[in-house]
Each structure stands twice: as structure tokens, then as C-alpha cells.
Amino acid sequence: GHWGAWMPSSISAFEGTCVSIPCRFDFPDELRPAVVHGVWYFNSPYPKNYPPVVFKSRTQVVHESFQGRSRLLGDLGLRNCTLLLSNVSPELGGKYYFRGDLGGYNQYTFSEHSVLDIVNTPNIVVPPEVVAGTEVEVSCMVPDNCPELRPELSWLGHEGLGEPAVLGRLREDEGTWVQVSLLHFVPTREANGHRLGCQASFPNTTLQFEGYASMDVKYPPVIVEMNSSVEAIEGSHVSLLCGADSNPPPLLTWMRDGTVLREAVAESLLLELEEVTPAEDGVYACLAENAYGQDNRTVGLSVMYAPWKPTVNGTMVAVEGETVSILCSTQSNPDPILTIFKEKQILSTVIYESELQLELPAVSPEDDGEYWCVAENQYGQRATAFNLSVEFAPVLLLESHCAAARDTVQCLCVVKSNPEPSVAFELPSRNVTVNESEREFVYSERSGLVLTSILTLRGQAQAPPRVICTARNLYGAKSLELPFQGAHRLMWAKIGP
């Protein structure tokens, strides 16, 4: 043999109970002591420090703290130094050293020592990770190193968590003993934060010890708080709230069209939109994610706004008889009432649509003119004017005539036409044609689609001449002999050389 000792590096005991510190030692065989003595020291191995003597085999003299509380269970002659401490109290917690005394110069304090921990709560061991939906084993362990008092274990607050299985007394690696009870159950998210307790009691004593552990159940997020669809007026302030329940707290992300707008590790996340515009109308998604899973929900934001100024597309110039199609469109929320007017007369209207198609089959000159497209909802009204130009061959109106006044003859040729025609006055009896370009004789005035050309003739009285008015544009020509009204005296002018 050689000098050496074996004892648990640490050992525990409940306050008020006892503890047996198992201990073996060895020494060289050739020392052959007649009697083996030993000393247990508290907290220091150096005799020079005068550490408290826990037990001494040579004498009954021990430190007052250990008076009547220490006894050697082992037989030193058999190299067993097992120590029993009774009625342990917190001040007895610390290091215990054994010193073998073989006589002569052979006294040896073993560096191996035992640290006694005085406890007053059972140790509830919960796995480092408890996940909802996955079976877990929770154990309650208490020291069982007192041969005189054996603990009995019971669970507290385990209702609905399964029936406990008592494993009984187990030997630990270093020779210490524990009493173990197991609880197997499948935790739910609701079990998070649940206080689970274990009670150690000692029969025939009033000693009772309780310990508790709060369950830290990990579970994936569930979004529990979310706006229903939101309507907001353009320019107003909008708050979108997303709240999730999870453990650990989730990473909450507000997204729109794949773009992250805001994110944070939190139980709830507010997305603030200042002065919303129609561009922010759409579907917003909240994503909640932790290591155990994810959840997502969406909310629609509807930004309410007055119609935009309508845009008008289509043919603005048409030939008489053609079909004209004009599209008036706008953007608003809600969709507007769209109306097309002409001279205060409603031509077409739609309710809650963003576009209005106006169809004019076989347009006539009467369709020519200014039109209005008006868009209106509860937030406002906007209008756009547009002109439709209907093109047609000249029409000589009935008010065309000639009239004499003293020494002058005036001929009016009134033409309705689009585009504007060229007008010529023909005097067949004189084989003369006067064009509108001859400003000395012809004066033209246009009002809308009506062109009035006036030919003024000066001269001596005579029988009235025949005057033919001809109007011409790209769609055709029309001629009319102008009727004469009033006196039959002709005042004529010589035209030309």
C-alpha cells in the first residue's frame, strides 16, 4: 500500500439530519502500526492552524461545534475512516480532512477531502431545454447519506403532469447516495412558468423540505394580436399592431411585398405609418419567428382618398358618321361615380368603377363640342374637360341670302362645316368668282362651326345679279344660289380690269 485516502469530494445533507461521509485510507504495509488512530479536521488540514477537531480517536476532546455530534462509523484498523455527523446545521458546512496517526513519526493528513453542503431544498432537475409537445423527464433529487433518517419524496403542483415514478436510492459516482423521483410528461405551452414542487419529508420527524422549479417551456410563436383590416383616410396616421405569444420571445417582422418595414425581438411590434398615401395601400404581413417555429398573419390597409383628376383617352377628332369611343379613367378609394356630361346633359355614368367608356355611334355635327368627365366619391370631386371635334362636309344654311340697301347689295353665305371651308361667290352672268381672300369685297366671320361670309357689291341700280355661294372642305363642296330679298335695284361693282 501507499499513503492515500478515498472520500467523496462533495456530499450533501439536509439541515437537522445526519451525514455519513464514506472514507477509506491506506498506508505502506511495512509501517505495521499496533493501533491506528485518526483525526478529522474541519476546514484546514494544517494542525498548526489549530483547525476545529471534529473527531479524534485518541481522546474524546473535540471542538464545541462537534460535541456530541461526531462519531466514527469506520474501523480505523480496517483502514475505514467513515465519519458520522448528527443533527447537522449550516455552520457545519465546509471541508473535512482526515489525518491518519500510525504512531511514531507516521502521521499523515490526506489532501483528499470532502466538502459538506448543508441544504434545505430538494434539487429539482429540469432538462436544459423543455419543448412543448416533446416528452420531458423532470427529476427530484435529495441527498440520502444519513443512515438514521431516510427521506421520502412527493411532488407538488404536478396535477395533470403525469404520475411520478420513484426510482429509489441511487449510488452516485463517488459513493454518495441520493433519493430520486421522476416525473414524465408532455408539456404544453400553457405549462410555461408553471411552478413544480418537490417535498422531502422524514418519517417520525417534523423535518420537511420543499423545493420549486419554474418550468421554462419553449414553444413556437402564435400571433395572438393583430388589427383586422384597416381603413384610413389619406394623410392620416395609421398604427398596425402585431402581438405574438412564444418562448423565447419571437423576432417580429412587418413586411410588405417582400420588403422588411420593421423588425424587433419582442412580444408585440407596432408599425407606425405617418400621413399615409395611396401608395401605402395594400397587404401587410406580420411574421413571428423563434428557434421553435413561426407564424404569420396579414392585414389589409385600405387608404381612402378623393379621385384623382380623370384622364381621358380616345378619339378627339372624328368624321361625321364614325363611331367614337372615349375612355375616362381615374383612381380613388372607394371607387368613384364617373359621369360624362355635355352641356349639363348626362351622357353616361357608372357607379363605383374607376373607368367609364363613352361610345357615340355615327357622330353628327351636333356631337361636336366640350365634354366633362366628373369623378366623385365621399372624399371629393375632380373633373376633366375634353373637346370632341366632329368633321363633316359643308352645309349651306338657309339664312344665306342677298339683300339690297340703297346703292349696295350684300350677300350672306352661312356655312356650317368642320374643318373650316373655303368660300367663293360666283356671279355667272358676269363670269366672275370672288374668293374670301379678296378682303376688299368679302368679309368672313366664324362662330363655332358656322362661317358667315359677306360679299358686298356697290354700283348702279340694275336688275339683281345671280350670286352662287360655294363652300368647300376636304369632305366635299356645296353650292347655293343665294335668294334675293328686298328692292330689285342692283348696285354693282366692277371687279377686275
Partner: antibody, heavy 126, light 112 residues
Amino acid sequence: QVQLVQSGSELKKPGASVKVSCKASGYTFTNYGMNWVRQAPGQGLEWMGWINTYTGEPTYADDFTGRFVFSLDTSVSTAYLQISSLKAEDTAVYFCARNPINYYGINYEGYVMDYWGQGTLVTVSS
Amino acid sequence: DIVMTQSPDSLAVSLGERATINCKSSHSVLYSSNQKNYLAWYQQKPGQPPKLLIYWASTRESGVPDRFSGSGSGTDFTLTIINLQAEDVAVYYCHQYLSSLTFGQGTKLEIK
């Protein structure tokens, strides 16, 4: 040079006490253990035990427990042997003897007694 | 305890001759950890304290004449004095200091 000087002879009555001193010089007192050896008239040597002068811890041989006490006064490099309840059979010459000690942390190794005091005769007689 | 037995109890040797004293221990005094024999020899003259002659069974203490030598191992040991001188008359003790310290009963050496 190393010297161990013991106190003089003592004549004591049975039941009395005696205290024998051993003053050391010429070396570091706490580096050596101090032993006590008894020699009854015309008899051999009997080891009574020793005291660790560094720690103050005494060790008694099995036949010398109870009435025998080893003590120290390191300030004057002196060891003491006190015998109480003296008996006639305690009549003997008492020697102190030093022994080297080699320390290893909390433990040590003791060696042979190399220097002896001159001896103190204690006579117990009524 | 380890019992030390010396032989003879006494012997007479002529001056200049060799004296041999034996010592037997009841158990080995050889320490396995350092392979040393924890045995010493002392000389005690009348009215004087013992004087150390030999330790570790064979190592001579300083100042001791080389006429004195020790030998042996385990349980059997011998003290040899050659060229015996008149001042060598004394009682010789063997002593083990491995376990609880013990002495032999002593051997008385005289001049023949």
C-alpha cells in the same frame, strides 16, 4: 554547536507532578521534532513519544497516554515533559532528543534522533 | 509494535579485535517508498545519554570513527566494531524508527 540542556534531578512523592524542561540551542528549534525517552534504573530505552515543534502537535506512545503531557515554549526554544500522579515506577532518567523533520506541504517525514539531552533523573519515593 | 531483539546480551572482546552485535526486528523496517532501512545504532556509556553511531542501517554519523560499521536489510542487522578500543566499552542499542519507535534490549560490550 547543537545543545540540549535539561533541568536538574527531581525528587517527588507519589501522586505529585513534575515538569522537566529541555532547552535547545545551536539550531532552528521548529525545524526538528522533540522526543522524550525514558530509561528506568539499569533498564533499556523506552520511547515515550514526541512533539512536533512546528505545529505543537504531540504524539504519545501507547504506554504513555493520560498522565504524560508534552508542551512547548517556542519563544525560548524549550520543550517540556509534565508527569502527573507520579508513581514509584516512574522513577527513571528522562531524556529529550531531537529528530530532523522533512516537511512536504501538510505532511512530513521524521528521521532518527541525532542529539540527546544529558538526562533528568526523576525519583518518586515516599 | 515492532519488537527489536539483540544478541548477545553481552560480550567480551579483546582490545584490537572485532566485535559483532546482531539485531533482529519482528517485521521489516525497509520502507518501500524510499528503499531505506529505518534502523539506527546507539552507544551509551554509564551516566551519559545515548550517542548516535549509525542510521539508515549503514550510514555513519559524522564524527564517528570508521571502526564502526553497520550492515543488513529488512529484519536482520549487524553492528561491527573492528580494532576494539578501550573507549568502546558501553551498552549498544539498535533502534527502529519506521513505525512506533522501539529499541533493542541492549548489548553490553566489555574488554576481555
